[in-house]
Interface confidence: low
């Protein structure tokens, strides 16, 4: 529907509060280094302008596109050149090239200080003093650190953030009330950011078709009672929402997401029996709830897939008439029958089916050629099943920290050129698959594990893309979205790697390690482990274990010592020497 003024349309649809929040998120995701106050000023100027357009849609400039209005506003930032360097060149371009240029300069790993959580009383005072600024600051800090965070979902997080402070700042024990809630929001927020980053990578690197295939598979698992036409409609709408958000069109994205939630709830009888509670909720919670809703029960007595997709004499005719629709139907039918499979496995099966039809429908006897296509699926299904079984056994044997260490060693040997912080972050996250998924029964393990690993490996891919250092990583990340995990799993030790020079400074520790949280201390030790492997990639598990055990004992001993700093200096030298000897460095 054509509106005289797009900005007025979105302002009216979303309301002033959501409009301002979404514009702030959009600006912070584009200009990640700008101070908070500058962004607030820009947002207020845009909001005042929007209000003039609501009052009179024919007013000057009200007919301009949102990209033009927002881009013009961003380009008024005086320090653009000195803060962002070549990003300032975007401002010389016209839309839509200017927006594309801004998108290309989004930084997945911006050079920003770590967010340090102040004392609870300090936070509560700040919250009570100026609630509005406090909440805007939250949006700003998250958005600039996560430039692809799903904006309407960030509004939901902000609402929960506000609620946590509203409740806990009045509690008798503020910290006991607030800190667990903030930890939960932080962990959920990181997970949400990573999941959305994969959606955007899927759209931007592999195209709309790849995203739609993912959506068909996932929605068919979730809504197995919905008919194919219904799933197709939802996929089309969902693709539009995510394309908009990934493209920086946050107002349109939030508006369309609300429309999609409304549609789903109005049509829940033909979609899923699990939506009732979600659809009772207010908008932000409703959308979040729908996105996380459990899979509906599979319809009873679904016929065999073979009838339509192998045995029918019309397979090639149906495929030729509308390839993507036919493959979409195959994916839908397979996915709704297999909530126990990961989405990426379902996509591999669909790709195998497509490849087989491409080959066989051109053969002399097509049916004879594709008759055994389902047999080709068996090894594809068994590979992730076996991998998950082995890794869950290892996790149960080692526990999370040591399981992460095993993965750190494994991945450092595969791709030793990758930076140590990236290897630590990615391997720690890979290791969390154990506690996240291994507790599930067999039928839920694969969708949990392999789809989670896709999200984590995408983090590796986007971080590596910023500063590429390994051809192997580039290859696994770019060749096939659905085969990324098997590609990384198949990598062996990189025999071409020249071990890193030994640097004693890397293994010098100080008394400050004693005051760190358990998590931070683990990260320090895991950083040292990665560096060890980079120095000695041929080191055996036993050698590395011995050195790490000595290291843990050294930290424990010196943290108990009266003169900690002296202990770290003297015992540290001994440890480095002993480690060098043990590893033959």
């Amino acid at each position: 529907d054509a509106h005289k003024s797009e900005v007025a349309h979105r302002f009216k649809d979303l309301g002033e509060e959501n409009f301002k929040a979404l514009v702030l998120i959009a600006f912070a995701q584009y200009l990640q280094q700008c101070p908070f106050e500058d962004h607030v000023k820009l947002v207020n100027e845009v909001t005042e302008f929007a209000k003039t357009c609501v009052a009179d849609e024919s007013a000057e400039n009200c007919d301009k596109s949102l990209h033009t209005l927002f881009g013009d506003k961003l380009c008024t930032v005086a320090t653009l050149r000195e803060t962002y360097g070549e990003m300032a060149d975007c401002c010389a371009k016209q839309e839509p090239e200017r927006n594309e240029c801004f998108l290309q300069h989004k930084d997945d790993n911006p050079n920003l200080p770590r967010l340090v959580r102040p004392e609870v009383d300090v936070m509560c005072t700040a919250f009570h003093d100026n609630e509005e600024t406090f909440l805007k600051k939250y949006l700003y800090e998250i958005a600039r650190r996560h430039p692809y965070f799903y904006a309407p979902e960030l509004l939901f997080f902000a609402k929960r953030y506000k609620a946590a402070f509203t409740e806990c700042c009045q509690a008798a024990d503020k910290a006991a009330c607030l800190l667990p809630k903030l930890d939960e929001l932080r962990d959920e927020g990181k997970a949400s950011s990573a999941k959305q980053r994969l959606k955007c990578a899927s759209l931007q690197k592999f195209g709309e078709r790849a995203f739609k295939a993912w959506a068909v598979a996932r929605l068919s698992q979730r809504f197995p009672k919905a008919e194919f036409a219904e799933v197709s409609k939802l996929v089309t709408d969902l693709t539009k929402v995510h394309t908009e958000c990934c493209h920086g069109d946050l107002l349109e994205c939030a508006d369309d997401r609300a429309d999609l939630a409304k549609y789903i709830c109005e049509n829940q009888d033909s979609i899923s029996s699990k939506l009732k509670e979600c659809c009772e909720k207010p908008l932000l919670e409703k959308s979040h709830c729908i996105a996380e809703v459990e899979n509906d029960e599979m319809p009873a007595d679904l016929p065999s897939l073979a009838a339509d997709f192998v045995e029918s004499k019309d397979v090639c005719k149906n495929y030729a008439e509308a390839k993507d629709v036919f493959l979409g139907m195959f994916l839908y039918e397979y996915a709704r029958r297999h909530p126990d499979y990961s989405v990426v496995l379902l996509l591999r099966l669909a790709k195998t089916y497509e490849t087989t039809l491409e080959k066989c429908c051109a053969a002399a006897d097509p049916h004879e050629c594709y008759a055994k296509v389902f047999d080709e699926f068996k090894p594809l299904v068994e590979e992730p099943q076996n991998l998950i079984k082995q890794n869950c056994e290892l996790f149960e044997q080692l526990g999370e920290y040591k399981f992460q260490n095993a993965l750190l060693v494994r991945y450092t040997k595969k791709v030793p050129q990758v930076s140590t912080p990236t290897l630590v972050e990615v391997s720690r996250n890979l290791g969390k698959v154990g506690s996240k998924c291994c507790k599930h029964p067999e039928a839920k393990r694969m969708p949990c594990a392999e789809d989670y690993l896709s999200v984590v490996l995408n983090q590796l891919c986007v971080l590596h893309e910023k500063t590429p250092v390994s051809d192997r990583v580039t290859k696994c990340c770019t060749e096939s979205l659905v085969n990324r995990r098997p590609c990384f799993s198949a990598l062996e030790v990189d025999e071409t790697y020249v071990p890193k020079e030994f640097n004693a400074e890397t293994f010098t520790f100080h008394a400050d390690i004693c005051t760190l949280s358990e998590k931070e201390r683990q990260i320090k030790k895991q950083t040292a482990l990665v560096e060890l492997v980079k120095h000695k990639p041929k080191a055996t598990k036993e050698q590395l274990k011995a050195v790490m055990d000595d290291f843990a004992a050294f930290v424990e001993k010196c943290c108990k010592a009266d003169d900690k700093e002296t202990c770290f200096a003297e015992e540290g030298k001994k440890l480095v020497a002993a480690s060098q000897a043990a590893l033959g460095l």
Epitope: A163, E277, E280, K281, P282
Partner: nanobody
Framework: EVQLVESGGGVVQPGDSLRLSCAAS????????MGWFRQAPGKEREFVSA????????YYANSVKGRFTISRDNSKNTVYLQLNSLRPEDTALYYC?????????????????WGQGTLVTVSS
């Protein structure tokens, strides 16, 4: 713009009952969460009860649980609050409120529209 008008308040004795009504106009009533709040003289406004759009969820303050009942009739654009076993401490101005987007049903800042209030006095 939603308008809310409360009625049904009055003066009663401890142990008596009252039924408050709140009629809504100017919006799609069935899309709103409806809540009741009250403010006693010299005190802050406090949450009493709330009901979700299709009456699936109801919420009550601990002080009124088991005595007050909230209900709604979407065909009549009206929400009700049945007050039983009234106590002197229930004396207050009772407000009806409507919210499109609340997730924290008990928080007054989540409600967008408010009525003028109806006075309930419990005294022997």
């Amino acid at each position: 713009e939603v308008q809310l008008v409360e009625s049904g308040g009055g003066v009663v004795q401890p142990g008596d009952s009252l039924r408050l009504s709140c009629a809504a106009s100017g919006g799609t009533f069935s899309t709103y969460v409806m809540g009741w709040f009250r403010q006693a003289p010299g005190k802050e406004r406090e949450f009493v009860s709330a009901i979700s759009q299709n009456s699936i969820h109801t919420y009550y303050a601990n002080s009124v649980k088991g005595r007050f009942t909230i209900s709604r009739d979407n065909s009549k654009n009206t929400v009700y609050l049945q007050l039983n076993s009234l106590r002197p401490e229930d004396t207050a101005l009772y407000y009806c409120a409507a919210s499109r987007f609340t997730s924290w049903y008990t928080a007054d800042y989540e409600y967008d529209y408010w009525g003028q209030g109806t006075l309930v006095t419990v005294s022997s």
